[in-house]
Interface confidence: medium
């Protein structure tokens, strides 16, 4: 246990610096604003749990090595563009629902132990906001998810396999967004 | 509440065809793995293959492939098992169950196919 | 495809008795499930995830294990109790296995 942390604590230094900027951004811009829907919102403790941290980071480590395509971010501040703080815990569940509809449960053999783990949690997440909805019109947030499904889908499994490597990212952004 | 309902009995000879449907309903269809499952009389379960009905994706037990087509209808909430060269070692109950995560929460009734010259 | 061994092949208890299935499993799983299945109905998924209870199911049944080594265990068996047995994998690609199962009689 003691060397997965090591090796996840390494993980998180190494490959997830690049999104330090990302989960500033969102730290900074006040990332537990009280949302539209006093339902999207996650307990903390769903976050403080080290052994599914690990294991979601572990699994979003062993997809990102088989990914190829280094160029293309899903999760990145363009998901973000023109979504107000309040709003961007009910953008982050329609980006969980599809990344659990999508990419998770059809690609539910690839990556174990870890994937079989991972998915009944974030599973979970995504049933405690299913009651999560924003006042008024959400096209402005539906036209930034559209834009990751679409890169997803254009990508085919090479696609999928993308957005398993950035379920760390997802999670935290969750993590900001929701709590 | 999670119901699959699944066509009747069958009788077939050996060579032939037959196509099995499987009517889900209380969920939402597409999200979940749809596997049918076989048990010959007197025997054990034997997997035969899944679907997920949101993308069409498709996985076979290797003993099976080329013989049998698992196909879903999203319209109608149907998932299908087509196979193909019935021999009479194929006669058993097939279920048709639904995914609960890793494990296979809800079963259809089962419909029995009977191989006979 | 990872193979699955249950024993006993069959047992046969009295009522109130602990009775305990083992399943073993080829090489490293997960998670293990367990179902019963009686005479003429479909099976029914009582354990999930090695050790939790599928909601409505009595405490009576528990399950626990890992790596290779999973236990099914009734703590008090009831004459309703009577059915087979079987544990199932979903860990090896693509595949998901079931043990032979393990039939249960009341003595």
């Known amino acids: 246990m003691a060397a997965l942390q090591k090796s996840v604590s390494s993980f998180l230094m190494g490959t997830l610096a690049t999104s330090c900027l990302l989960l500033l951004a969102l730290l900074v811009q006040g990332g537990a604003a009280a949302p539209i829907s006093s339902h999207c919102r996650l307990d903390k403790s769903n976050f403080q749990q080290p052994y599914i941290t690990n294991r979601t980071f572990m699994l979003a480590k062993e997809a990102s090595l088989a990914d190829n395509n280094t160029d293309v971010r899903l999760i990145g501040e363009k998901l973000f563009h023109g979504v107000s703080m309040s709003e961007r815990c009910y953008l982050m569940k329609q980006v969980l629902n599809f990344t659990l509809e999508e990419v998770l449960f059809p690609q539910s053999d690839r990556f174990q132990p870890y994937m079989q783990e991972v998915v009944p949690f974030l599973a979970r997440l995504s049933n405690r906001l299913s009651t999560c909805h924003i006042e008024g019109d959400d096209l402005h947030i539906q036209r930034n998810v559209q834009k990751l499904k679409d890169t997803v889908k254009k990508l085919g499994e090479s696609g999928e396999i993308k957005a398993i490597g950035e379920l760390d990212l997802l999670f935290m952004s969750l993590r900001n967004a929701c709590i | 509440q999670v119901q699959l309902v699944q066509s009747g009995a069958e009788v077939k000879k050996p060579g032939a065809s037959v196509k099995v449907s499987c009517k889900a309903s209380?969920?939402?269809?597409?999200?979940?793995?749809i596997h049918w499952i076989r048990q010959p009389p007197g025997k054990g379960l034997e997997w035969i293959g899944r679907?997920?009905?949101?993308?069409?994706?498709?996985y076979y037990n290797e003993k099976f492939k080329g013989r049998v087509t698992i196909s879903a209808d999203k319209s109608i909430s149907t998932a299908y098992l087509q196979w193909s060269s019935l021999k009479a070692s194929d006669t058993a109950m097939y279920y048709c169950?639904?995914?609960?995560?890793?494990?296979?929460?809800?079963w259809g009734q089962g419909t029995l196919v009977t191989v006979s010259s | 495809a990872i193979q699955l061994t249950q024993s006993p092949s069959s047992l046969s208890a009295s009522v109130g008795d602990r009775v305990t299935i083992t399943c073993s499993a080829s090489?490293?799983?997960?998670?293990m499930h367990w179902y019963l299945q009686k005479p003429g109905q479909s099976p029914q998924l009582l354990i999930y995830?090695?050790?939790k209870l599928l909601s409505g199911v009595p405490s009576r049944f528990s399950g626990s294990g890992s790596g290779t080594d999973f236990t099914f265990t009734i703590s008090s068996l009831e004459a309703e109790d009577a059915a087979t047995y079987y544990c199932?994998?979903?860990?090896?690609?693509?595949?998901?296995?079931f043990g032979q199962g393990t039939k249960v009689e009341i003595k």
């Open positions: 169950a639904r995914s609960y995560d890793y494990s296979v929460a809800y």
């Open positions: 209380g969920y939402i269809f597409r999200s979940y793995w």
């Open positions: 995830e090695t050790s």
């Open positions: 199932q994998q979903w860990s090896s690609n693509p595949y998901i296995t």
């Open positions: 679907i997920y009905p949101g993308t069409g994706r498709t």
């Open positions: 090489s490293s799983v997960s998670y």
